[in-house]
Interface confidence: medium
């Protein structure tokens, strides 16, 4: 079957890294500089991605694979194949149209990306606030007052954020 297909379409013999050159009697020609073909049998080579501006080259383009980009320090990738770079903020901030802004009271962000999220409302789980929240950290919920008997002092991890909690000042 392969032999039959090859007789019908000589381009099927062209391996990755080459293209089937119609201008040269369908000879397999190497991809020109700054281009690639990742599969065999291609009639053209694709232009290599250029990582410029805030994009850095993570992997150079080769004749058989495209370049891969990541983002310069201070930025992080978004989208499939790092199609965009978004600037980092500090912990305790979120990115807005006006750049990085501090989290509002009652919210936190413990990462350099993403949005500020409400503190856990410990009372929803019948617990009390053991450690107050900050712009960078969620509150830590402790046992409910009723649970505070001798020997019962384990701290439960914060529950998923549901609505703004209130941190006693």
């Amino acid at each position: 079957f392969e032999r039959t297909r090859s007789l019908q379409d000589p381009c099927s013999n062209c391996p990755a890294g080459t293209f089937c050159d119609n201008n040269r009697n369908q000879i397999c020609s190497p991809c020109p500089p700054n281009s690639f073909s990742s599969a065999g049998g291609q009639r053209t080579c694709d232009i290599c991605r250029q990582c410029k501006g805030v994009f850095r080259t993570r992997k150079e383009c080769s004749s058989t694979s495209n370049a891969e980009c990541d983002c310069t320090p201070g930025f992080h990738c978004l989208g499939a194949g790092c199609s965009m770079c978004e600037q980092d903020c500090k912990q305790g901030q979120e990115l807005t149209k006006k750049g990085c802004k501090d989290c509002c009271f009652g919210t936190f962000n413990d990462q350099k990306r993403g949005i500020c999220r409400p503190w856990t409302n410990c009372s929803l789980d019948g617990k009390s606030v053991l450690v107050n929240g900050t712009k960078e950290r969620d509150v830590v919920c402790g046992p409910s007052p009723a649970d505070l008997s001798p020997g019962a002092s384990s701290v439960t991890p914060p529950a998923p954020a549901r609505e703004p909690g209130h941190s006693p000042q």
Partner: nanobody, 123 residues
Framework: EVQLVESGGGLVQPGGSLRLSCAAS????????MTWFRQAPGGGLEWVAN????????YYVDSVEGRFTVSRDNAKNSLDLQMNSLRAEDTAVYYC????????????????WGQGTTVTVSS
């Protein structure tokens, strides 16, 4: 090909002015937020200013507020940055970038960048 090309950089004395331009091609310019960044020698990239699709919203980093003005001409596919009262600390390579607004729940990704134009403020 989607492209951004900056121009207008140069050497200027403290207190002087420069106007940077960014020519866009290969995409529908009026559909995108646009942003200016800069990179001082030996430093990281710093967001400077951005402008929404029709030019009605403009935002600036605190250090340039009142001195720099971002504008755009959608008919000419151009983005400008008017820089007045320049200071030594404004010395940097300035880049324009296309904003990738509308990507998922994160709205501030940049997907196309120019090659940069150098501004040197020195006496």
């Amino acid at each position: 090909e989607v492209q951004l090309v900056e121009s207008g950089g140069g050497l200027v004395q403290p207190g002087g002015s420069l106007r940077l331009s960014c020519a866009a091609s290969g995409f529908t310019f009026s559909n995108y937020w646009m942003t200016w960044f800069r990179q001082a020698p030996g430093g990281g990239l710093e967001w400077v200013a951005n402008i929404n699709q029709d030019g009605s919203e403009k935002y600036y980093v605190d250090s340039v507020e009142g001195r720099f003005t971002v504008s755009r001409d959608n008919a000419k596919n151009s983005l400008d940055l008017q820089m007045n009262s320049l200071r030594a600390e404004d010395t940097a390579v300035y880049y324009c970038a296309r904003g990738g607004l509308g990507y998922g729940d994160s709205h501030y990704g940049m997907d196309v960048w120019g090659q940069g134009t150098t501004v040197t403020v020195s006496s």
